[in-house]
């Protein structure tokens, strides 16, 4: 495998991770695929310090993160444990609200204008943040 030692152009390094902040909007699944195409994942927030860093860069704009409950329980896209991990939900969130009239509930988490988290309809075209870890060997698949 190959090891990434510095961040790609236009990515921001912070605490041994690289972050890319979109300036356009996509549905959650499309944002997830964009990050995967870039060998990254939607941002996984593991501490108050990381929360403040991301919040500083995105400003007061709804922005997707790598947290969803589309298959039942809440899960981080990189496998980080949700139950024991950092959380920063708005009061009374997540609420899986069905009253939006778009069908179904709310299965994807985003940063709100004050940085705290809300669950929302995954199809909404919000901005997003990709994250990839430095010094993590990328397991390049063997050639067939």
């Amino acid at each position: 495998g190959s090891e990434r030692t510095c961040c790609p152009v236009n990515w921001v390094e912070h605490e041994r991770s690289c972050y890319w902040f979109s300036r356009s909007g996509k549905a959650w699944a499309d944002a997830d695929n964009y990050c995967r195409l870039e060998d990254a994942h939607l941002v996984v927030v593991t501490s108050w310090e990381e929360q403040k860093f991301v919040q500083h860069h995105i400003g007061p704009v709804n922005t997707w993160m790598g947290l969803h409950d589309q298959n039942g329980p809440w899960k981080w896209v990189d496998g980080t444990d949700y139950e024991t991990g950092f959380k920063n939900w708005r009061p009374e969130q997540p609420d899986d609200w069905y009253g939006h009239g778009l069908g179904g509930g709310e299965d994807c988490a985003h940063f709100t204008d004050d940085g705290r988290w809300n669950d929302d309809v995954c199809q909404r075209p919000y901005r997003w943040v990709c994250e990839t870890e430095l010094d993590k060997a990328s397991q390049e698949p063997p050639l067939l």
Epitope: A27, D30, E38, S138
Partner: antibody, heavy 117, light 108 residues
Framework: EVQLLESGGGLVQPGGSLRLSCAAS????????MSWVRQAPGKGLEWVSA????????FYADSVKGRFTISRDNSKNTLYLQMNSLRAEDTAVYYC??????????WGQGTLVTVSS | DIQMTQSPSSLSASVGDRITITCRAS??????LGWYQQKPGKAPERLIY???SLQSGVPSRFSGSGSGTEFTLTISSLQPEDFATYYC??????????FGQGTKVEIK
């Protein structure tokens, strides 16, 4: 200068296999996602497959899923497309393309694949 | 999947004419749209990215506009080398990346 050079096309019978290659130069190959796009004779452009810079994450069009495999060798700056169970409708010019910010910015000149008995 | 509907499928024009090609997306794609030119027997070349940004080295007679679901490519004064086929491409929602059907610009 970005250069992409495809090879490996040719005539193959239905059900047969072929492996296309795309040799890249002029940019840091491992840092960029890459893709294959095809064009049937006299028809429009159709996206086929894409891979992230490391090759870990791959994407396929429904029409080729389970039959085609995209891969890359970053030590050789080369992209591959392994095509199995080929059908007449796979006949096309196959282009490799570099991706930046999710969109194709540079293309090779293409290699023709003809599937016929 | 997002469908891209391009019109017209072909058009005849003269050198010096102003022409417009339209691409409509089946759902909103923001400005995640590119325009490509393809000449017979050649690979496509990117003219426009992000709906309205001109690719480096592309003449300024080419311009793109639009956002959401409706986009246009305009050639302000058609030149002999502009007779080709033009494709739009959306990259807001992938996979799949989807192209318009193409517009063939022919000499009148």
């Amino acid at each position: 200068e970005v250069q992409l050079l495809e090879s490996g096309g040719g005539l193959v019978q239905p059900g047969g296999s072929l492996r296309l290659s795309c040799a890249a130069s002029g940019f840091t190959f491992r840092s960029y996602a890459m893709s294959w796009v095809r064009q049937a004779p006299g028809k429009g452009l159709e996206w086929v497959s894409a891979t992230s810079g490391s090759g870990v994450n791959t994407f396929y069009a429904d029409s080729v899923k389970g039959r085609f495999t995209i891969s890359r060798d970053n030590s050789k700056n080369t992209l591959y497309l392994q095509m199995n169970s080929l059908r007449a409708e796979d006949t096309a010019v196959y282009y490799c393309a570099k991706l930046e910010l999710g969109i194709f910015d540079y293309w090779g000149q293409g290699t023709l694949v003809t599937v016929s008995s | 999947d997002i469908q891209m509907t391009q019109s017209p499928s072909s058009l005849s024009a003269s050198v010096g004419d102003r022409i417009t090609i339209t691409c409509r997306a089946s759902q909103g794609i923001g400005n995640d749209l590119g325009w490509y030119q393809q000449k017979p027997g050649k690979a496509p070349e990117r003219l426009i990215y992000a709906a309205s940004s001109l690719q480096s080295g592309v003449p300024s007679r080419f311009s793109g506009s639009g956002s959401g679901t409706e986009f246009t490519l305009t050639i302000s004064s058609l030149q002999p080398e502009d007779f080709a086929t033009y494709y739009c491409l959306q990259h807001n929602s992938f996979p799949p990346w989807t192209f318009g059907q193409g517009t063939k610009v022919e000499i009148k």
